[in-house]
Interface confidence: low
C-alpha cells in the first residue's frame, strides 16, 4: 500500500491554516486500524501518533517552510511512510503603511496622552514597526509583532513633542515608510500679567493710558479681555500669540482696580489686579494718577 501526504492549501500564505491529510489510495483506512503521525524535517508534529489521518495546523509561518511527510502504522506494527512534500509558506510584503494619531488630527493638549498608531494594509509574519521624530528622523522605538498595527505612546505630551513623525514597517522585504504626520501641542494660557504704560511718569487727566496684557505661555490665537473693576472695557486678539494692548483716555473716574483675562479656548486665566489712584500733589494745578 502506498501513502501520500496532501497539504491543503499547498502554497499557504503566512498566518493561514493548513490541513495535512495522510491518504492511502488503494486501502480504506477503515479496512484496518491505523495510527497516523505527521513529521516536519525530523520532528513529529501535533499529538504524535493518532487515529486521525488529518492534522490541522492553525497558522503557518515563514519558518514553518520545510519538508513534510506522514507515517501510518497498523496494529501489526507495520509502518508505511509517505514521500516528502515541500511546503513553502508565502510571506506577504508590507504595503500601504500609514501613521495615525490618537487623539485624531494630531492636535493634543499639553500633559495629555498621545498615541502614534502605525498600520499596514497588508503584510504577514513578524512585522517590525519603527517610529521616527524630528529633523533627522530620531528613532523613538521599535516593536516587532505579528499584527498589522502597533502603537507608540507618549504618556504626557510636552511642548517639545510638537514635531513631525513618521513610521516604518518591515517584514524582510525592505523598509516601507509612512507619510509624515505633524503633531501640534496645544498649551492652555498661563496667568497673564497686566502692565500699565503712560506717556510720562505721572499720568494726567486726558493722557492716553495703555493697558498691556500678556500670557507668557499658551497656544495662539489668544483673546484678551480688559476690565476696570468688574466692568468690561473691551477685548483684543493676538492671532499669533504674545500680548495685546488696550488704550484708555484718562478721566478722574478711571481710579480703581484694573485686570485682564487671557483665553485661548483651552481655558481662561485672569491677571492680578493693578490699582490706579488719582493724587493731587502739593502746589499742583492738575490731578495726577499713580499706580
Amino acid at each position: 500500500a502506498e501513502l501520500f501526504l496532501i497539504a491543503s492549501p499547498s502554497h499557504p500564505t503566512e498566518g493561514s491554516p493548513v490541513t495535512l491529510t495522510c491518504k492511502m489510495p488503494f486501502l480504506q483506512s477503515s479496512d484496518a486500524q491505523f495510527q497516523f503521525c505527521f513529521f516536519r524535517d525530523t520532528r513529529a508534529l501535533g499529538p504524535g501518533w493518532s487515529s486521525s489521518p488529518k492534522l490541522q495546523i492553525a497558522a503557518m509561518w515563514k519558518e514553518d517552510t520545510g519538508s513534510y511527510w506522514c507515517e501510518a502504522q497498523t496494529m501489526a506494527s507495520k509502518v508505511l511512510r509517505s514521500r516528502r512534500s515541500q511546503i513553502n509558506v508565502h510571506r506577504v510584503p508590507v504595503a500601504d503603511v500609514s501613521l495615525e494619531t490618537q487623539p485624531p488630527g494630531g492636535q493634543v493638549m499639553e500633559g495629555d496622552r498621545l498615541v502614534l498608531i502605525c498600520s499596514v494594509a497588508m503584510g504577514t509574519g513578524d512585522i517590525t514597526f519603527l517610529w521616527y521624530k524630528g529633523a533627522v528622523g530620531l528613532n523613538l522605538q521599535s516593536k516587532t509583532q505579528r499584527s498589522l498595527t502597533a502603537e507608540y505612546e507618549i504618556p504626557s505630551v510636552r511642548e517639545s513633542d510638537a514635531e513631525q513623525y513618521y513610521c516604518v514597517a518591515e517584514n524582510g522585504y525592505g523598509p516601507s515608510p509612512s507619510g509624515l504626520v505633524s503633531i501640534t501641542v496645544r498649551i492652555p494660557v498661563s496667568r497673564p500679567i497686566l502692565m500699565l504704560r503712560a506717556p510720562r511718569a505721572q499720568a494726567a487727566v486726558e493722557d492716553v493710558l495703555e493697558l498691556h496684557c500678556e500670557a507668557l505661555r499658551g497656544s495662539p490665537p489668544i483673546l484678551y479681555w480688559f476690565y476696570h473693576e468688574d466692568i468690561t472695557l473691551g477685548s483684543r486678539s493676538a492671532p499669533s500669540g504674545g500680548g495685546a494692548s488696550f488704550n484708555l483716555s484718562l478721566t478722574e473716574e478711571h481710579s480703581g482696580n484694573y485686570s485682564c483675562e487671557a483665553n485661548n479656548g483651552l481655558g481662561a486665566q485672569r491677571s492680578e489686579a493693578v490699582t490706579l489712584n488719582f493724587t493731587v500733589p502739593t502746589g499742583a494745578r492738575s490731578n495726577h494718577l499713580t499706580s
Epitope: 521616527y132 529633523a135 533627522v136 530620531l138 516604518v168
Partner: antibody, heavy 117, light 112 residues
Amino acid sequence: QVQLVQSGAEVKKPGASVKVSCKASGYTFTRYWMHWVKQAPGQGLEWIGRIDPNSGGSKYNEKFKSKATITVDKSTSTAYMELSSLRSEDTAVYYCTRVNSGAMDYWGQGTLVTVSS
Amino acid sequence: DIVMTQSPDSLAVSLGERATINCKSSQSLLYSSNQKNYLAWYQQKPGQPPKLLIYWASTRESGVPDRFSGSGSGTDFTLTISSLQAEDVAVYYCQQYSNYPTFGQGTKVEIK
C-alpha cells in the same frame, strides 16, 4: 533604483546668486528628508540644512541661515538650494543627500559652484 | 553644536593589514530609549560623493564589504578595515545625527 541627479557646474561673480537643483527618482520623494552638504576645495563636509518635501518645512545650520534657501517642487520630485550674495568662500561642491533614519544613504553627484570676479 | 573629532588625520597601512580610525563626539550619541548610537561612517574617494558605510554606529549598509566594521558607544567610536584593499584608499568621515548633522574633519587612508 534611487537616484539623485544634480544640475551642472556654475561660475558666478561675487554678489550674484545661484540656484542648484537635485532631481530625485526611484523612491517616494515626499517620504524622506533632503539635506544639503557643502564641501569646499580640499576641505571636509559641512551640513547646510534640510527640507521636508512633504510639508516644505526647512531647517538650517545657523551659519547658512542668511546664505541658503532650500525649496522643493513636489510635482517634479526636485529639491533646490539657492545661494545668495556669493563670495569667494562660497566656492565649493554642493551635494544633495537623502536621509533615511538619520543617515545619509544616497547622494547626488555634486555641483561645483565657482565664485570668481 | 555637537563637535566630532577624528584621529588620526591620515593613516598609511600596508595592503592586507588592519586600519583603525577613531571618532570622538563632544556629547553622548547614545539614545537611551532605544539604546542606539546616532553615528554614521562615510567613505569618499576623489571626485566622488561620500558613500554610506555604517549607520547606528555598527550596522553595515547593504552592499558594503564585511571587512568594514563599526564599534563604540556614547562618545567614542571606531571604524575598522580588517584587511586593507587597494580600493579602500579614500577619506573617511564620521557623522553624528543625534542633533543637526555634524561631521568629523576626515581621515585620509593611504597604502604604505
